[in-house]
Structure formats: C-alpha cells, structure tokens
C-alpha cells in the first residue's frame, strides 16, 4: 500500500481467483483514543471500532472511502484504490492502446519545436468518474524539472457504437536547452483513476524523436511566363525554432491530381521555393521535416493549381 | 580549418560533409520496427558517448562568442564514433548487409574530423570504451544504439556547421 496523495491510498493486488489479498491497517487521524467507529462509503454499517481498523482487501468491494467517526462527528477519511496485477502485469483497462508506433502505446506525445514544450494525449472509452494527474521529468535517477498543466478533454469521437474520448496535457521543460544533444529522455507519468481503480501509464522519449513541425505557412503560386510551370513558395511555420539558419527544415513538394490514383510528382528541397508543373484540377502540397534528424513530417499545406 | 589557435574551419565544407553524415547515419539505421532502446540492457557502450551539452557553446550565441569550444566537442565526438564504427561491434559477426553504408559513414566521420583538425594539431580526445569483443548476439543491439546515438550527435553538428556557414563564414 502507498499514498497517492493526502488521504488517498493505492493497494496493489495480485488479481487471481482465491488470492489472499492484502492486509491493510487504517489509522484514524485524530488525537482521540476511544469511542471511534469505522464505516465504508455511504453505508452506516459499523465495520469496527478503535483508533485502527484492520481489513483484508481482496476485491473492489473492499475498496472505497473509509471514514472514522466519534459521536456522529467525522474525524478523518481514507480512500482506498486498487491497482490490479494479473499474471505479473499491471492492468491497463482505463486507456486504449493506440498501437502506434508500436503495440502497448497508451500515451502519444508531440513537439512543434525544440523549445522543451510538448503535448501528450491518450484515449479512453470511459466518460464518467475519471481523473488524471500528470507528472514529468527529464531523466529518472536525478530528475530535472518539467512542468505539466492539468489534463483536459480535448476531443470526442464516435467509433462504431462506442464514443471515444481524447485527453491531452501540455508540458514545458523548466530549463530547456534547444541546441543541445539530449542524453537523458523525458519521462511522462500519468496516474489514471476510474471509480476505485488506479492505473499508471508511462512514456519515455527524447524531444528530437517526437518533433512534428507545423505545416509551412503562406503557401503561394506564381505562374511562370509562357510555361505550364509555376513557382511555389512558402515560409517556415511561426512555431518552428529560430534561427532558421541553425534549426533548418527540409521540404517535400507534391503535385496531386484530383483522383487519388493519379501519379504524384514529388520534389524534395531545402529551399523555401520550388518550380513544378501545375496540371489542371491538381493541387500543390508542401510539408516540412527537420533537415538533419528524421522525425515526423508535418501535415500538408495545400493550394489548388487553378 | 579549426585549429587550437582559433582560426575558422572551412564552414561550407564542414556543412556539406556533416549533412552527408546525417543522411548516411539514417540510411545505416532507418527507424524500422521501432525498438525501445531504454527497455534493453547493454547500456555501457552508449552511456559513455560524448554528448553535445548545454555548456559546450554549440548554440547560435555560443558559436558567435567563440566557436572553438563547440568545435572541439564535435571533434571529440567524431573521433569517438569513428573508433566505435571501426570496432568489433561493427566489424564482427553477424555480418552487416552487403550494401550497408557503415563503411562510408566510418570514412566520412574520419574525413570531417580531419577537416576540423589538420595533422600536427592535437585536441584532447575522449577515452574510447573498451573495444573487446562483446558476444555476437549483443552486437545488433549495440549497433542499433550506437547508430541512434550517432544520428542525434551528427544532427547537432550539422546544425552548427549550417549556422556557421550562413553567419560565420568569412
């Protein structure tokens, strides 16, 4: 058993049939010594008396809010949550496996630049009685600070018969050093509580591996005289790290016909302009990637050829 | 060329070669199958690699003030990785794929380190970890880790030389 926060405790249970469970001793936070009784949740049934209560926690029915009283007055509460371990593996019932970039990916994170700011998100099908708390650090043995905000519901989607809820959180490394080569990964820890079930999820990454620039901005076409060619130009996204002579991007320019089956023409360039042939009804798209480290490409920025 | 006395390197040449190094490092190990390195053991070889840290002066401001600290750090790393790529980890069993660019990568690391430090000038180089052969089955994992680490190192080096070529070239 361990304390998650004040008056909230997590009991770690091996979850198999006929498991003996965990013996837990609760102590009433009071100077009083006698006349103390204990109840669980809204029930008025007295579970025991005395300053301490010993219980055998085996299942969710044994978890909940234990309250000690004296003469009708509430003295203190202890909320017991359960963390299930089945076949040696902690349960992951609350969050959905996003399966990208590999199985058992529950948290996904992205950064728009090297400033030390990043966003993580996760998915669940649970809509009520759900709370999250997020902690993060750089490194684990001698952790350096990363400050995370509160997790918020950022999207709702219908997937078949189910509703899916996306939560996200923004974090910022306290003393980020954008130009340095990271040697210790960022660790993100999410505590999830659904009713009386506790689970924790972690992700470990380098900012460089989760970089995904915003799409290029101000995408423009300039027709070239007496030619089907056009000059496409664009700019670095505002959110990208500066100076651009140091934090450089590379770009992919694509000419795509109306039909998805039509052959795509692609050009790769380090410049912020390119000359391409504009076909009728086609569109021109440009995306960006870090020039020197193969992290994710940005989403496409597009303009029609006409 | 960067020399301990403080003259400038051939920024443009260094920029071209460091960008080539980035391409080679990624073609030597594209991120396929996404192995989570932090779940694996055998850390000792990759823990000792020289990283370009915050105080090494490789940021734009630090390069403007005095690029020598940063160039020395980059040189140190290039020599370190050049030794690792020539070590048993890469030259031993199991064989690399026939068209593996590791040989080219090895030669380019040496080429860039020589651009930074001509013969006769000696910066202190970091101690190379023991190159005694690990068991062959450990090597694929070590190769993977070293190449991933090298990708990060050469990315910073390439940014330094690109910025130097754009803003510090005579």
């Amino acid at each position: 058993i361990w304390e998650l926060k004040k008056d909230v405790y997590v009991v770690e249970l091996d979850w198999y049939p006929d498991a003996p469970g965990e013996m837990v001793v609760l102590t009433c936070d009071t100077p009083e010594e006698d006349g103390i009784t204990w109840t669980l949740d809204q029930s008025s049934e007295v579970l025991g008396s005395g300053k301490t209560l010993t219980i055998q926690v085996k299942e969710f029915g044994d978890a909940g809010q234990y309250t000690c009283h004296k003469g009708g007055e509430v003295l203190s509460h202890s909320l017991l949550l359960l963390h299930k371990k089945e076949d040696g593996i902690w349960s992951t019932d609350i969050l959905k496996d996003q399966k990208e970039p590999k199985n058992k990916t529950f948290l996904r994170c992205e950064a728009k630049n090297y400033s030390g700011r990043f966003t993580c998100w996760w998915l669940t099908t649970i809509s009520t009685d759900l709370t999250f708390s997020v902690k993060s650090s750089r490194g684990s043995s001698d952790p350096q600070g990363v400050t995370c905000g509160a997790a918020t519901l950022s999207a709702e989607r219908v997937r078949g018969d189910n509703k899916e809820y996306e939560y996200s959180v923004e974090c910022q490394e306290d003393s980020a050093c954008p130009a340095a080569e990271e040697s210790l990964p960022i660790e993100v820890m999410v505590d999830a509580v659904h009713k009386l079930k506790y689970e924790n999820y972690t992700s470990s990454f380098f900012i460089r591996d989760i970089i995904k620039p915003d799409p290029p901005k101000n995408l423009q076409l300039k027709p070239l005289k007496n030619s089907r060619q056009v000059e496409v130009s664009w700019e670095y996204p505002d959110t990208w790290s500066t100076p651009h002579s140091y934090f450089s991007l590379t770009f992919c320019v694509q000419v795509q016909g109306k039909s998805k089956r039509e052959k795509k023409d692609r050009v790769f360039t380090d410049k912020t302009s390119a000359t391409v042939i504009c076909r009728k009804n086609a569109s021109i798209s440009v995306r960006a990637q870090d020039r020197y480290y193969s992290s994710s490409w940005s989403e496409w920025a597009s303009v029609p050829c006409s | 060329r960067a020399v301990p006395g403080g003259s400038s390197p051939a920024w443009t040449q260094c920029q071209q070669l460091s960008q080539k190094l980035c391409t080679l490092a990624w073609s030597a190990h594209p991120l396929v199958g996404h192995m989570d390195l932090r779940e694996e053991g055998d850390e000792e070889t990759t823990n000792d690699v020289p990283h370009i840290q915050c105080g090494d002066g490789c940021d734009p401001q630090g390069l403007r003030d005095n690029s020598q600290f940063c160039l020395q750090r980059i040189h140190q790393g290039l020599i370190f990785y050049e030794k690792l790529l020539g070590s048993d980890i890469f030259t031993g069993e199991p064989s690399l794929l026939p068209d593996s660019p590791v040989g080219q990568l090895h030669a380019s690391l040496l080429g860039l380190s020589q651009l930074l430090q001509p013969e006769g000038h000696h910066w202190e180089t970091q101690q190379i970890p023991s190159l005694s052969p690990s068991q062959p089955w450990q090597r694929l994992l070590l190769r993977f880790k070293i190449l991933r680490s090298l990708q990060a190192f050469v990315a910073v080096a390439a940014r330094v030389f690109a910025h130097g070529a754009a803003t510090l070239s005579p």
Partner: antibody, heavy 114, light 112 residues
C-alpha cells in the same frame, strides 16, 4: 569481386611453428573481421579465432591455449595465422573466412610429420 | 562452449526427393533481438565451405530457393525441397551466437 587467397601447402616437424597468410581483395579490408577455421582429415570444421583489422584485437578459441596468434598487415590487406608447438593432430586444412562466412580462402594444407 | 549435435551422419537421397538435416544446440541461439544465430554450409568434395543460410532462415546470395532453414532456438532444420545431383557434399551447421563459434559434425548427402 571479393577474393581471399591463401599461401601454399606446408610440411612441418612436430614442435615447429607455421604461419599461413590470407590476402584479401575486392573490399575494404578493415571493414570486416577475419576468422580462421581448420579442418582435420575427416573431422568437423573447427573455429580457431578472429581478428578485427582496425585495431588488431583478437578473440581465440581457448582450445588452442596460447598456441595460435592471428595478426594483420593492413597496408597489404593480409591476415596471418601462426600456430606454434605443432603436433601431428594439427595436420589439417586451414581456412581464412571473412566476417559473415560468405567468403572463404581456398584453404592451406599443413602437414605435421616427423 | 555451445555444443551442436547434427543428425543424420549420412543421408542417401533420390534426386527430386526432399531432404532434411537437423542440428540441436546445447543452448538457445535465439536472442532478444529476435535473431537466431545459426549458419548452414555445404562443402563439396575438395572445396571450401559455401554459405547457404544465415541467421537460421535467410538464404545467402545466389542460393537456390529449394534450400530453406527453420527451427526454434535449439532445434534447427535445413530442408532441401527437391534434391539435385549438384547438392552432394557435406552439410554443416554453425552457431555464431557466442565465442567460440562451433560447428555440427556434418551430414554427408549422397545420391542413391
């Protein structure tokens, strides 16, 4: 084209030493370790040791307890295997094989006889 | 040292028929990188060994697809789907998981 060309057959007396050479061509000599393997008449193949041509680091089969020494001359792209304190059971064909074992020398017959 | 036990010692086969050779390792050759560190060779009379299969199941360059390798970490098999006259010789398996590398005792394939 990758080629490993070994030195010619040798006849040695018991207690003597033999040094077999293996000249490599068609690839960058320092990019690949070189193994040495032997095969006594009618016997299975037996791995003797390996050398990293970059640094000269070696790993030997303990069966040969200090009797085997593998060296390289990188300027000549040549690997050498020396076996000392020869006995009659060392009569065998000795092969060099590049890392990966896809390329082998043609073999060198060493006969130990009084 | 890892001991490799190879069977059978001799294998008479009719051309066009399949053939199978087994090697058993005293220690698993499958490691956490998912690779199984076993090679198969053919040594024709008077020649140097020729690599057929590496990493248990990958055919070496120029090796016909009638040769295939499979197995678990300890029990490994070389199969020839249809034996041809040119396949005669001694077949060896070799582990390259740990030093010293060790070979099987060999299987002599002959045409009936």
């Amino acid at each position: 084209e990758v080629q490993l060309v070994q030195s010619g057959a040798e006849v040695k007396k018991p207690g003597a030493s033999v040094k077999v050479s293996c000249k490599a061509s068609g690839y960058s000599f320092t990019d690949h370790n070189m193994n040495w393997v032997r095969q006594a008449p009618g016997q299975r193949l037996e791995w003797m040791g390996v050398i990293n041509p970059n640094y000269g680091t070696t790993t030997y089969n303990q069966k040969f307890k200090g009797r085997v020494t593998i060296t390289v001359d990188t300027s000549a792209s040549t690997a050498y295997m020396e076996l000392s304190s020869l006995r009659s059971e060392d009569t065998a064909v000795y092969y060099c094989a590049r890392r990966g074992f896809a390329y082998w020398g043609q073999g060198t017959l060493v006969t130990v006889s009084s | 040292d890892i001991v490799i036990t190879q069977t059978p010692l001799s294998l008479p086969v009719t051309p066009g028929e399949p053939a199978s050779i087994s090697c058993r390792s005293s220690k698993s050759l499958l490691y956490k990188d998912g690779k199984t560190y076993l090679n198969w060779f053919l040594q024709r009379p008077g020649q140097s060994p020729q690599l057929l299969i590496y990493l248990m199941s990958t055919r070496a360059s120029g090796v016909p697809d009638r040769f295939s390798g499979s197995g678990s970490g300890t029990d490994l098999t070389l199969k020839i789907s249809r034996v041809e006259a040119e396949d005669v010789g001694v077949y060896y398996c070799q582990q390259i998981a740990e030093y010293p590398f060790t070979f099987g005792s060999g299987t002599k394939l002959e045409i009936k």
